[in-house]
């Protein structure tokens, strides 16, 4: 009678993560008597996957009933496959021995490859906000995919970016892989409503790439522009001065009025108006009693935005040149304004 052969008909099997792998194995003879075992890998470090004779294998089921006397089908199914299951599986026939069974013949092996989807890309921006014209870095990470081939693209508002660097780790063979990419983005004043998108394409996604997004509203700081103007007279000897705070983001803003360098009032931006580009405008006013001042008055609108150093704009009220009988709208002359940083 011809000597027993162990036949593994599939040289390779490709399975998606989470599915069941069927590893086929048949023997050509019932002799010699002895169990079949399945191993992953070869040599002394091989891992026992299934033993017909003993052991408990909660993930493995046999395709046919191995207790039947004439059974020669030793195929197995392994459930809930993960990338860690990848490797070459050997069906090995043992000959009954005493005290231990002796390895008799091995199949040629079946290479199990696992296709695993990448995790949803996670995009993260810089820790601190940055102002327009500055370049900021965004990172995108996705993990757990197999095989290694993967494509990553960056977009800003639908426009593909070109300034980025991508790494896939590890470099050598692995059960699964990770991708890490860093993109550089130049901020503009209009970016409050902008989005940065990281798009990952992989064979497991069947043409439907995964996307991760970051809103530039979390990253950008648009500093305000200030304008101090004198309004028409409200009452005898009173001048209304307004400070227009325009085009700022985020909303966090505190304004202080100074009269000749002395704090007159501090307020926090509350009822702001939003511009189409997502920035905010706000206006504060100060009623100045001109008759209370003997000399010219320097009014300063000082704004601290989002924890940054204060910016200010000043406006000079001349009180000496205003006879009482004249209208208050001529009682103050705008002698120009200057912008300075207060530290």
């Amino acid at each position: 009678e011809e000597e027993l052969q162990v036949i593994q008909p599939d040289k390779s099997v490709l399975v998606a993560a989470g599915e069941t792998a069927t590893l086929r194995c048949t023997a050509t003879s019932l002799i010699p008597v002895g169990p079949i075992q399945w191993f992953r890998g070869a040599g002394p470090g091989r891992e026992l996957i299934y033993n017909q004779k003993e052991g408990h294998f909660p993930r493995v089921t046999t395709v046919s009933d191995l207790t039947k006397r004439n059974n020669m089908d030793f195929s197995i199914r392994i459930g809930n496959i993960t990338p860690a299951d990848a490797g070459t599986y050997y069906c090995v026939k043992f000959r009954k021995g005493s005290p231990d069974d002796v390895e008799f013949k091995s199949g040629a092996g079946t290479e199990l490859s696992v296709r695993a989807k990448p995790s949803a890309p996670v995009v993260s921006g810089p820790a601190a906000r940055a102002t327009p014209q500055h370049t900021v870095s965004f990172t995108c990470e996705s993990h757990g995919f197999s095989p290694r081939d993967i494509t990553l693209k960056w977009f800003k508002n639908g426009n593909e970016l070109s300034d980025f660097q991508t790494n896939v780790d590890p470099v050598g063979e692995s059960v699964s892989y990770s991708i890490h990419s860093t993109a550089k983005v130049v901020l503009t004043r209009e970016d409050v409503h902008s989005q940065v998108i990281c798009e990952v394409a992989h064979v497991t996604l069947q043409g439907d790439p995964l996307r991760g997004t970051a809103n530039l509203s979390e990253t950008i700081r648009v500093p305000p522009t200030l304008e101090v103007t004198q309004q028409p007279v409200r009452a005898e000897n009173q001048v209304n001065v307004t400070c227009q705070v325009r085009k700022f983001y985020p909303q966090r803003l505190q304004l202080t009025w100074l009269e000749n360098g002395n704090v007159s009032r501090t307020e926090t931006a509350s009822t702001v108006t939003e511009n189409k580009d997502g920035t905010y405008n706000w206006m504060s006013w100060l009623l100045v009693n001109v008759s209370a001042h003997r000399d010219d008055v320097k009014l300063t609108c000082q704004v601290e935005h989002d924890g940054q150093p204060a910016v200010s704009k000043s406006h000079d009220l001349k009180v000496s040149a205003h006879p009482k009988e004249q209208g208050s709208n001529t009682a103050a002359e705008n002698t120009g304004s200057n912008e300075r940083n207060i530290y």
């Epitope: 003993e54 052991g55 408990h56 909660p58 993930r59 459930g79 809930n80 005290p99």
Partner: antibody, heavy 123, light 108 residues
């Protein structure tokens, strides 16, 4: 801290169904390579394996009890349960729930045990 | 099913002595599938040794295990009063999992 706690009626009438619940904390019941089992111990006697269920819902039962036993898991509550139907006085025992871990290469054993609950079958 | 027979049924020794507990299997089993549990009075069992000789976490090294085939041994090198318990062997070689009937260890 990892804990297992059995709960259920201490007294069941003959021919009725014994129902026990094991609530676990410190780990999740759907963790890969983890299973949950029931073992019982009649008063003054040894341990008898009833059965266990793995994270992938594979179930194994003692053939002597199989026709009467159901083990199920509720992962949302981190609980698993035992139902033993048509009980007799011979089912009087301390019932233990235990975690079974799979270590690869066919090796599995009971790593953590609950304190046990005494169930008496009597009319 | 595999039947495990433990001997002796009861073992009574003095503190400091060496205790040898035996577990015999009705079928040959691989050493990786033989485990030992300790059950102290009024308590649940706890894993003592897995795979014939691997001490579970927190078990003092005066406990050791050995054996192969059908004959397995649990040894306590120097008995301590807190070792009073019933010791069970268990096989995970084949379903149904089975336990030995236990050896009761007493301290004189």
């Amino acid at each position: 801290q990892l804990q297992l706690q059995e709960s259920g009626p201490g007294l069941v009438k003959p021919s009725e169904t014994l129902s026990l619940t094991c609530t676990v904390s410190g780990f999740s019941l759907n963790t890969y390579d983890i299973g949950m089992g029931w073992i019982r111990q009649p008063p003054g006697k040894g341990l008898e394996w009833i059965g266990h269920i793995w994270w992938n819902d594979r179930e194994y039962y003692n053939s002597a009890l199989q026709s009467r036993v159901t083990i199920s898991v509720d992962t949302s509550k981190n609980q698993f349960s035992l139902k033993l139907s048509s009980v007799t006085a011979a089912d009087t025992a301390v019932y233990y729930c235990a975690r079974i871990d799979y270590f690869g290469s066919g090796q599995a054993w009971f790593t953590y045990w609950g304190q046990g609950t005494l169930v008496t079958v009597s009319s | 099913e595999i039947v495990l027979t433990q001997s002796p049924g009861t073992l009574s020794l003095s503190p400091g002595e060496r205790a040898t507990l035996s577990c015999s299997s009705s079928s040959t089993i691989s050493s990786t599938y033989l485990h030992w549990y300790q059950q102290k009075p009024g308590q649940a069992p706890r894993l003592l040794i897995s795979g014939t000789s691997n001490l579970a976490s927190g078990i003092p090294d005066r406990f050791s295990g050995s054996g192969s085939g059908t004959d397995y041994t649990l040894t306590i090198s120097r008995l301590e009063p807190e070792d009073v318990a019933v010791y069970y062997c268990q096989q995970g070689s084949r379903i149904p999992f089975t336990f030995g009937q236990g050896t009761k260890l007493e301290i004189k």
